[in-house]
């Protein structure tokens, strides 16, 4: 198995996922494409945790670029052995993967909490409330109750869709980073497959 190519593949995947996370999080600030709710602070509290922008986004780009860099041919050597440096790099990628696990984990947790609590919306009495907070997430199964939110229009669908996307993307990122931890440990300890498909023993 070529650990470097695997890492690079994971890296590119993470860049795409991170950008999607950032986009999904940004969309949460503009229900129905309107800016008024963000400016009036009428958004779910979990939107302000920047879970997709920071956790599943920016924090994920660091390990992503580290993983992509592992496949470069001009990887620095150590002790006069080029491959030794590559092994060091693979092991250091484990640290980057752990940062990714923390970021994606944060994204998943916040998205799950956002889904469970439901959106901040104008209820049938004209109050800004977390209308579904007391339902312990049961509102997700009963779409007939979603009309209790009168403004922003389709806010429940908006929040559920985007937090679900963040939850899924964060989950995929978490799994990929976990794979890279295993990949990095195996690549660092058991050797590194170079472009010439050479295998070196530890």
């Amino acid at each position: 198995m070529c650990y470097g190519k695997c890492a690079r593949c994971i890296g590119h995947s993470l860049v795409g996922l991170a950008l999607l996370c950032i986009a999904a999080n940004i969309l949460l600030y503009f229900p129905n494409g309107e800016t008024k709710y963000a400016s009036e602070n009428h958004l779910s509290r979990f939107v302000w945790f920047f879970s997709g922008i920071v956790g599943g986004g920016l924090l994920m780009l660091l390990p992503a670029f580290v993983f992509i860099g592992l496949e470069q041919d001009d990887c620095c050597g150590c002790c006069g052995h080029e491959n030794c440096g590559k092994r060091c790099a693979m092991l250091s990628s484990v640290l980057a993967a752990l940062i990714g696990i923390a970021g994606s984990g944060y994204c998943v947790i916040v998205a799950a909490l956002g889904l469970a609590e439901g959106p901040l919306c104008l209820d049938s009495l004209g109050q800004w409330n977390y209308t579904f907070a007391s339902t312990e997430g049961q509102y997700l199964l009963d779409t007939s109750t979603w009309s209790e939110c009168t403004e922003p229009k389709h806010i429940v669908e908006w929040n559920v869709s985007l937090f679900s996307i963040l939850l899924a993307l964060g989950g995929i990122e978490f799994i990929l980073c976990l794979i890279q931890v295993i990949n990095g440990v195996l690549g660092g300890i058991c050797g590194f497959c170079c472009s010439h498909q050479q295998q070196y023993d530890c």
Epitope: L125, G126, T150, E151, P152, K153
Partner: antibody, heavy 120, light 106 residues
Framework: QIQLVQSGPELKKPGETVKISCKAS????????VKWVKQAPGKDLKWMGW????????IYAADFKGRFAFSLETSASTAFLQINNLKNEDTATYFC?????????????WGAGTTVTVSS | QIILSQSPAILSASPGEKVTMTCRAN?????INWYQQKPGSSPKPWIY???NLASGVPARFGGSGSGTSYSLTISRVEAEDAATYYC?????????FGAGTKLELR
């Protein structure tokens, strides 16, 4: 000056339709909701429901579903209450009320009221 | 629905006297609003959020309470205070008003 100006008194026969207007001035109409309150002669106040002036979405209290309709003419900063198939028990003064979405939600500006008399 | 019971229905007082009217809910609510209505006029916001005086309301008025029991107090009644006072809750759907307390001056 913030005010809600309501249309004049109405005398109607049972089965007829009445449409009351409530014109807002002195504030941004779409930033506040408009609620409607009924007060029958010698009786207490009864909340009929409200209309979201931003989305146009009407919400009706259980006792006022069916014959009652809230609507808007946003360009004229005006809210309307229409009562169809009038009954004697609809005889009352109807108030339109502005309310704000603050920490303590209350009716901060009231219209003078429109008296509707239903009599055959 | 939450039912608000106001007592007394009619309250007679002499100028300078201290008076208290109460509003009880059949279930716990988070706050209450009070409105003053004089004959032939629309109600005016008087006290909101249980204890906050609306704009232009004299400082002799005060509000207090929590849970199911709320009250409006006038430290020294004046002739202009003669009116009907309604309490209103906004904690539960439907929004409801009390039947009112009519304050008469002797």
């Amino acid at each position: 000056q913030i005010q809600l100006v309501q249309s004049g008194p109405e005398l109607k026969k049972p089965g007829e339709t009445v449409k009351i207007s409530c014109k807002a001035s002195g504030y941004t109409f779409t930033n506040y909701g408009v609620k409607w309150v009924k007060q029958a002669p010698g009786k207490d106040l009864k909340w009929m429901g409200w209309i979201n002036t931003y989305t146009g979405n009407p919400i009706y209290a259980a006792d006022f579903k069916g014959r009652f309709a809230f609507s808007l003419e946003t360009s004229a900063s005006t809210a309307f209450l229409q009562i169809n198939n009038l009954k004697n028990e609809d005889t009352a003064t109807y108030f339109c009320v502005r309310f704000q979405y603050g920490d303590y939600r209350y009716f901060d500006v009231w219209g003078a009221g429109t008296t509707v008399t239903v009599s055959s | 629905q939450i039912i608000l019971s106001q007592s007394p229905a009619i309250l007679s007082a002499s100028p300078g006297e201290k008076v208290t009217m109460t509003c009880r809910a059949n279930s716990g609510i988070s706050f209450i609003n009070w409105y003053q209505q004089k004959p032939g006029s629309s109600p005016k916001p008087w006290i909101y959020g249980t204890a906050n005086l609306a704009s232009g309301v004299p400082a002799r008025f005060g509000g207090s309470g929590s849970g199911t029991s709320y009250s409006l107090t006038i430290s020294r009644v004046e002739a202009e205070d003669a009116a009907t006072y309604y309490c209103q809750q906004w904690s539960s759907n439907p929004l409801t008003f009390g039947a009112g307390t009519k304050l008469e001056l002797r």
